[in-house]
C-alpha cells in the first residue's frame, strides 16, 4: 500500500499520527523506492546505465533541475520559492512518468505506482503551500504533442530516454526532500 | 565484516591513465541502498573526495575532478573501480576505496559518510 | 572550491577534553545534518567516528561527540588517553552530490 494510503495508519492504533511535513517525507522515499527497482529493470534489459553518450540524448529532453534561482540550496533557501519549485518540477515530470507506463514489462505495476504515488505527493505539497498562484501547470497540449514525439522515437532512444528519466527524477525528489527537511 | 581491498599498479607515467580496483567481500555491493566511494590521500596530506558510485550505479565527482574521473561496477565480480586519466606527479596519493550510505544517504544523495575502507594502496606518478 | 576550515593541531593532557572545529559554509556544513568525523592513526586508513553531525558510528566510545552550529561542526574527545593521539578529519556534503574533507587536524596528547 503506497504511505498516501492510510490502512498502515489504522493497522497500529498507538502510534502517533503521521505530520504532514513525515507523510511528505515517506512518501518520497517510497517514490525513490519504486524508481531503483524500475532502473533494475531498465539497466538489467539494456546497457543504458553504463552509456557515456548521456549528454547527447539528454539535450533533448526538457527534464526539470533544481538550480540556485530555485531558492532550494541552502545558500539562498526560500521556504516558498522552493515550495513552488517542488510542486511545478513534480507537475512537469507528469508527461515524462506517463511515457514510463509502457516502458516496463515485468515492472508494469511498479511503475503505475510511482506515477500515483507522484500524484498523491503533489496533493500532499499543495495543501503545504501558500503561494498557489505562482504555480503554472503545464499545458496539456504542449504535453500531449511530447508523449507522441517521445513514442516516436527509435529503440535505442526510448532506452536512454526511459534512463534519463529515472535518473532525472530520482535526482529531484533528493534534492526536494533535502530541501523539505530545511522546511 | 564487509572488507575492501584495493588492487592496481603502484607506478603509472605520466599522462597516462590510473586504473584501480576494488573488492569487496562480506556483502555484495549490489545490495541495499550502500554507495561505493574513492578517496586519495596525497603523501603528508589531507583526504580528498574523488567520487561515488551509488546503488542504482549512478556516479557523481568532485567537479574539479569530474572530466579525467571515472567509476564503474561488476556486480557479477563485487567490484567496482576507478580510472583516472592524463595523470600527472601530483596524482601521486594513497588512493582508498570505501563504503557509504548510512542513514537516509540514498534518499537524499549525501554520501559523505563512508563506515568501511580499503587499507588504501600507495600509487607513484613518475617517468 | 576549498575544502572545509580544521586547525592544523591541537593537544591536551591525558583524562582531559579536547574539542576540534570545522568551519565550512551555507554550502556544506550549514545545510541539513550533514557531517562526518574520522579518525585516522598514524599508517592506517580512516576510520568513521561520528555521522550526521552527532551519531556515533558502530564501536565508537561515547567519550567522541559531535555537535553543530551554523556553518561550524565540532568534535569533542572527553577523557583523552594516549591512543586517541591521531588525525581527525571533518567530512561534509556539499550540494549537488558532492563530498568535501576538512584539511585535517593532529592531536597530540600530552605526557
Known amino acids: 500500500v503506497p504511505p498516501g494510503e492510510d490502512s498502515k495508519d489504522v493497522a497500529a492504533p498507538h502510534r502517533q499520527p503521521l505530520t504532514s511535513s513525515e507523510r511528505i517525507d515517506k512518501q518520497i522515499r517510497y517514490i525513490l523506492d519504486g524508481i531503483s527497482a524500475l532502473r533494475k529493470e531498465t539497466c538489467n534489459k539494456s546497457n543504458m546505465c553504463e552509456s557515456s553518450k548521456e549528454a547527447l540524448a539528454e539535450n533533448n529532453l526538457n527534464l526539470p533541475k533544481m538550480a540556485e534561482k530555485d531558492g532550494c540550496f541552502q545558500s539562498g533557501f526560500n521556504e516558498e520559492t522552493c515550495l513552488v519549485k517542488i510542486i511545478t518540477g513534480l507537475l512537469e515530470f507528469e508527461v515524462y512518468l506517463e511515457y514510463l507506463q509502457n516502458r516496463f514489462e515485468s515492472s508494469e505495476e511498479q511503475a503505475r505506482a510511482v506515477q500515483m504515488s507522484t500524484k498523491v505527493l503533489i496533493q500532499f505539497l499543495q495543501k503545504k503551500a501558500k503561494n498557489l498562484d505562482a504555480i503554472t501547470t503545464p499545458d496539456p497540449t504542449t504535453n500531449a504533442s511530447l508523449l507522441t514525439k517521445l513514442q516516436a522515437q527509435n529503440q535505442w532512444l526510448q532506452d536512454m530516454t526511459t534512463h534519463l528519466i529515472l535518473r532525472s527524477f530520482k535526482e529531484f525528489l533528493q534534492s526536494s526532500l533535502r530541501a523539505l527537511r530545511q522546511m | 565484516e564487509v572488507q575492501l581491498q584495493e588492487s592496481g599498479p603502484g607506478l603509472v607515467k605520466p599522462s597516462q591513465t590510473l586504473s584501480l580496483t576494488c573488492t569487496v567481500s562480506g556483502g555484495s555491493i549490489a545490495t541495499s541502498y550502500y554507495a561505493w566511494s574513492w578517496i586519495r590521500q596525497p603523501p603528508g596530506k589531507g583526504l580528498e573526495w574523488m567520487g561515488v558510485i551509488d546503488y542504482d550505479g549512478d556516479t557523481y565527482y568532485k567537479p574539479s575532478l569530474k572530466s579525467r574521473t571515472s567509476i564503474s561496477r561488476d556486480t557479477s565480480k563485487n567490484q567496482f573501480s576507478l580510472q583516472l586519466s592524463s595523470v600527472t606527479p601530483e596524482d601521486t596519493a594513497v588512493y582508498y576505496c570505501?563504503?557509504?550510505?548510512?542513514?537516509?544517504?540514498?534518499?537524499?544523495?549525501?554520501?559523505?559518510?563512508?563506515?568501511?575502507w580499503g587499507k588504501g594502496t600507495l600509487v607513484t606518478v613518475s617517468s | 572550491q576549498a575544502g572545509l576550515t580544521q586547525p592544523p593541531s591541537v593537544s591536551g593532557s591525558p583524562g582531559k577534553t579536547v574539542t576540534i572545529s570545522c568551519a565550512g559554509t551555507?554550502?556544506?556544513?550549514?545545510?541539513?545534518?550533514?557531517v562526518s568525523w574520522y579518525q585516522q592513526l598514524p599508517g592506517m586508513a580512516p576510520k568513521l567516528l561520528i555521522y550526521d553531525v552527532n551519531k556515533r558510528a558502530s564501536g565508537i566510545a561515547d567519550r567522541f561527540s559531535g555537535s553543530k552550529s551554523g556553518n561550524t561542526a565540532s568534535l569533542t574527545i572527553s577523557g583523552l588517553q594516549s591512543e586517541d593521539e591521531a588525525d581527525y578529519y571533518c567530512a561534509s556534503y556539499r550540494s549537488l552530490n558532492n563530498v568535501v574533507f576538512g584539511g585535517g587536524t593532529h592531536l597530540t596528547v600530552l605526557g
Open positions: 551555507t554550502s556544506d556544513v550549514g545545510t541539513g545534518n550533514f
Open positions: 570505501a563504503r557509504a550510505g548510512l542513514g537516509d544517504s540514498y534518499y537524499l544523495g549525501t554520501y559523505y559518510a563512508m563506515d568501511y
